[in-house]
């Protein structure tokens, strides 16, 4: 469940046997790209005892041994050492392929395979390139969210990835909205998940040398119906000067379509409340908004009569919610006093 797609380098292939001598044969003119283990940090390549530079036709770069085009003089012994401990991580001999006759039988050169771009790699069964990104196995996601499962892997030949849901091949054909399979990111993406998406999702990564699999368990949380939720602190108590413009904000969260009203509390016959106990109000504005949008009440050129209590009332099919705030309107001559008062200044809404 990752928010963004990150671009990853084309994976290099690690020599197969760590800390054991390995012989690889390379054709003249072939590019070579080998990596030192599965980390880029703190690894350096040496040829015949000399550390390779990070630039040039033959280079040691970010833990990789890269040869742009293999030449006879590139044959030789290469070591990858861990910086600090100087431990030998890989001990590798590269030979021209016409030197095969000079290899004694007991050296057992590893099979090489060429990719479409001509790079030479040792063959390797699939392996996870970023297991730490797969640590979170159990996922519980609110309905409507997007889910992304990743199984970043490598191998040679390049493995294929297939997805299963509850043990069955999964292509998303029965899923409203389908799925997105991004093979270059080894990912499965499902948008707007619903309860029927619950299940066990397994990536199966395989090539001719083997297969690996990993499962994610997905639970989808149904949104329980509730009356609108109003953001705490909104609308906020506000102080304004006569003649200024004021905005009162109300932020409403509601799964069901909310219906919003702005009310101003009024006094009738000297009373703020009717016989039924409810306050007397005047409806200033009625609107329907989309979920999680801000509803604004604009008051232009306010006068002393605009002072008082304002209420944001939000309702949906489940119930009603409301929050209130006070608007204080000051005469023009009090402007310097209000701006000098930190608390008053913090609630001051000036819109000329």
């Amino acid at each position: 469940l990752e928010a963004s797609e990150e671009m990853e380098q084309e994976p290099c292939l690690a020599p197969i046997l760590e800390q054991q001598e390995q012989v690889l044969t390379v054709a003249l003119g072939q590019p070579v790209r080998l990596c030192c283990g599965r980390t880029e940090r703190g690894r350096h390549w040496y040829k015949e005892g000399s550390r390779l530079a990070s630039a040039g036709r033959v280079r040691g770069w970010r833990g990789r041994l890269e040869i742009a085009s293999f030449l006879p003089e590139d044959a030789g012994r290469y070591l990858c050492l861990a910086r600090g401990s100087m431990t030998v991580v890989h001990n590798l001999t590269l030979l021209m392929d016409d030197s095969l006759t000079s290899i004694s039988n007991d050296e057992d050169p590893k099979t090489l395979s060429s990719s479409s771009s001509g790079h030479v790699y040792p063959q390797q069964a699939p392996y996870w390139t970023h297991p730490q990104r797969m640590e979170k196995k159990l996922h519980a996601v609110p309905a409507g969210n997007t889910v992304k499962f990743r199984c970043p892997a490598a191998g040679n030949p390049m493995p294929t990835i297939h997805w299963l849901k509850d043990g069955q091949a999964f292509h998303g054909e029965n899923r409203i909205g389908g799925i997105r399979l991004r093979h270059q990111h080894w990912s499965l993406v499902m948008e707007s998940v619903v309860p029927s998406d619950r299940g066990t999702y397994t990536c199966l990564v395989e090539n001719s040398l083997g297969s690996i699999r990993y499962s994610y368990l997905l639970d989808v949380l149904e949104r329980s119906p509730h009356r609108p939720i109003l953001q705490a602190g909104l609308p906020a108590n506000t102080t304004a000067v006569v003649g200024s413009d004021v905005e009162l904000l109300c932020k409403v969260y509601s799964d069901a379509q909310p219906h919003i009203q702005w009310l101003k509390h009024v006094v009738i016959n000297g009373s703020s409340f009717g016989a039924d106990g409810f306050p007397y109000v005047q409806v200033l504005k009625t609107t329907d908004i989309n979920s999680s949008e801000v509803e604004v009440l604009y008051l232009r050129n306010v006068s002393a009569e605009d002072a008082g209590e304002y209420t944001c009332l939000a309702g949906n099919s489940i119930g009603l919610s409301y929050q209130s705030a006070w608007l204080t309107v000051l005469p023009e001559e009090d402007l310097t006093w209000t701006t000098a008062t930190p608390e008053a200044a913090s609630h001051h809404h000036h819109h000329h």
């Epitope: 797969m134 640590e135 196995k137 519980a140 619950r198 299940g199 397994t202 699999r213 990993y214 639970d219």
Partner: antibody, heavy 119, light 112 residues
Framework: EVQLLESGGGLVQPGGSLRLSCAAS????????MAWVRQAPGKGLEWVSV????????VYADSVKGRFTISRDNSKNTLYLQMNSLRAEDTAVYYC????????????WGQGTLVTVSS | QSVLTQPPSASGTPGQGVTISCSGS????????VNWYQQLPGAAPKLLIY???LRPSGVPARFSGSKSGTSASLAISGLRSEDEADYYC????????????FGGGTKLTVLG
Amino acid sequence: EVQLLESGGGLVQPGGSLRLSCAASGFTFSTYWMAWVRQAPGKGLEWVSVIGPSGGMTVYADSVKGRFTISRDNSKNTLYLQMNSLRAEDTAVYYCARINSGSSHFDYWGQGTLVTVSS
Amino acid sequence: QSVLTQPPSASGTPGQGVTISCSGSSSNIGSNSVNWYQQLPGAAPKLLIYSNNLRPSGVPARFSGSKSGTSASLAISGLRSEDEADYYCAAWDDGLDAYVVFGGGTKLTVLG
């Protein structure tokens, strides 16, 4: 403090039924995956079942599939295990466990309740 | 027969170190992190190590975990009498279904 308290164990005849409960406290129960793990007398631990926070996603060990049902009531902070068609080999201490949401291990365990299946 | 293989017993004297192994396959330890649980006599299991090598708060640094390929191990240094317990390794297994597998448990005896 996280607490898990199992109850409902006892003696039951083969073919009979029993319902175990696990009362949870000290954490937001409705957001966690939960599990049942059992241990036969003198034997090792065996995973039984897991359930997602919604209660709608469940997985079972092959040995109990079709006979046991895991469920939960988030309003009561309680996990259940309905055990039907019980067999002698189901005799065990049954533990309720909370699953850590980050790396999927059992981070808290209850004290267990003993289920004995015998005629 | 447990899916993960542990030695049934291990022993050491106070102050010594001991290592308990746990062997699995590519579908469990090979693809998932390993957790270790300690079960003192007559008590419920307790989390000891999670995510291969991490200790929950309250677990002494004498306990450490590691994983390589399809095997894992629990090392206990400076053995104390209160370490006498059963130790279980566990991991998720991504076979035909996803489920949790345990080792058969290792009974650690602190001698003397």
